[in-house]
Amino acid sequence: MAVTACQGLGFVVSLIGIAGIIAATCMDQWSTQDLYNNPVTAVFNYQGLWRSCVRESSGFTECRGYFTLLGLPAMLQAVRALMIVGIVLGAIGLLVSIFALKCIRIGSMEDSAKANMTLTSGIMFIVSGLCAIAGVSVFANMLVTNFWMSTANMYTGMGGMVQTVQTRYTFGAALFVGWVAGGLTLIGGVMMCIACRGLAPEETNYKAVSYHASGHSVAYKPGGFKASTGFGSNTKNKKIYDGGARTEDEVQSYPSKHDYV
């Protein structure tokens, strides 16, 4: 039961995380105009990965896409790439994890296959989360660098007569969404990996083979050398955690690690 819960929770957390990564990637507020020196600005600038926007006091908002690829900073391109890779990996991870869910039955898929799929999706979620966190962090670092550079030459002009205020940008809402979403995807991935350990069979198990001795019959189960394997205590080989609801004859053939905890 705990495996299913861990896997299910991991899936849900990752799903929320990936939705957040997609939202962050699409958001326009990656960087917003710093209002420290002018809190009552009549023109407010903010920028995303794909376009920059200007919101006026009048309520008029104008957004312009970055219609060039080559003219964009390499760092911005890198952030875009990281976020897209994160989304793609996350989406594939979600697809894989749907089929890996213990509560979903697909044909006669064995636990080992589900375990492998769970591990694969978990790793994908971890990498996806890391990509998002890395992308957002690279952008944040870029902002910090530019912020202090623009602060250094905040006012430029002819003999101090004419002032040209350079627009400084600070962290936008998308950065926080991205960090949280990346973290959630990462946590979801870790949960999937933990769930995988519970799903994976210890070793290759074979059907119980009976050896008939002269006096009385003894059931011998190879490979069950752990003290906690339940040797001799569960001769019907029923699942312990679900109160013996399924027998060996049913779909679930292989006992998993978690069954004996």
Epitope: V43, V162, Q166
Partner: antibody, heavy 118, light 113 residues
């Protein structure tokens, strides 16, 4: 047709109060930022106050801050300017204006005259 | 506060003549986000409220004759009337729309010879 009609002006003593109103029609009032602009007897234009679309943000120049309050009643399509602690330098023609792109004021009312004198 | 300086304070012209008036701001009105200059030009005829002519320094308001042209960037702006008509006789004001407080120039009065 867009129409802005100001009212409430008049003669008031220094230190007195006055509330100006601006009835808007011919456009979706809730979708526009509105402002008050005054014109002194010397014909100088001075921005007095701005209220953003939702009414959550208001802006004033230092000369009127703390004395004037801009507000709007979206249900009545009306803009207000509550003026208190009036000074002789507040004597002017007060115009109600609508802001559009570029923060430009595309429509102005005919104005209401305010005279602060003892 | 951004100081707006208009020159000349008055202009005496003849009908059909080309007229240029200038407006200087103490601070740049160019917004880096959209590369637009937040300067507006208004025309005020006697006994009337001001009328919007040009916004974003060079964008003509709908219904404004094309003889009115706004130009300039940063801190220096001009309003040009290619061929002055009798109905153009008015006071022209420039305004900073970039940052609060919004400030107006003292105006340029256009008079007929």
């Amino acid at each position: 047709d867009v129409k802005l009609v100001e009212s409430g002006g008049g003669l008031v003593k220094p230190g007195g109060s006055l509330k100006l109103s601006c009835a808007a029609s011919g456009f979706t009032f809730t979708s526009y930022t509105m402002s008050w602009v005054r014109q002194t007897p010397e014909k100088r234009l001075e921005w007095v106050a701005t209220i953003i679309i939702g009414g959550s943000y208001t802006y004033y120049p230092d000369s009127v801050k703390g004395r004037f309050t801009i507000s709007r009643d979206n249900a009545k399509n009306t803009l207000y300017l509550q003026m208190s602690s009036l000074k002789s330098e507040d004597t002017a023609m007060y115009y109600c204006t609508r802001l559009v792109k570029g923060n430009a004021m595309d429509y102005w009312g005919q104005g209401t005259s305010v005279t602060v004198s003892s | 506060d951004i100081l707006m300086t208009q020159s000349p304070s008055s202009l005496t012209v003849t009908a059909g003549e080309k007229v240029t008036m200038t407006c200087k701001s103490s601070q740049s009105l160019l917004n880096s986000g959209n590369q637009k200059n937040y300067l507006t030009w208004y025309q005020q005829k006697p006994g009337q409220p001001p009328k919007l002519l040009i916004y974003w320094a060079s964008s003509r308001e709908s219904g404004v004759p094309d003889r009115f042209t706004g130009s300039g960037s940063g801190t220096d702006f001009t309003l040009t009337i290619s061929s002055v008509q009798a109905e153009d006789l008015a006071v022209y004001y420039c305004q900073n729309d970039y940052s609060y407080p919004f400030t107006f120039g003292a105006g340029t009065k256009l008079e007929l010879k």
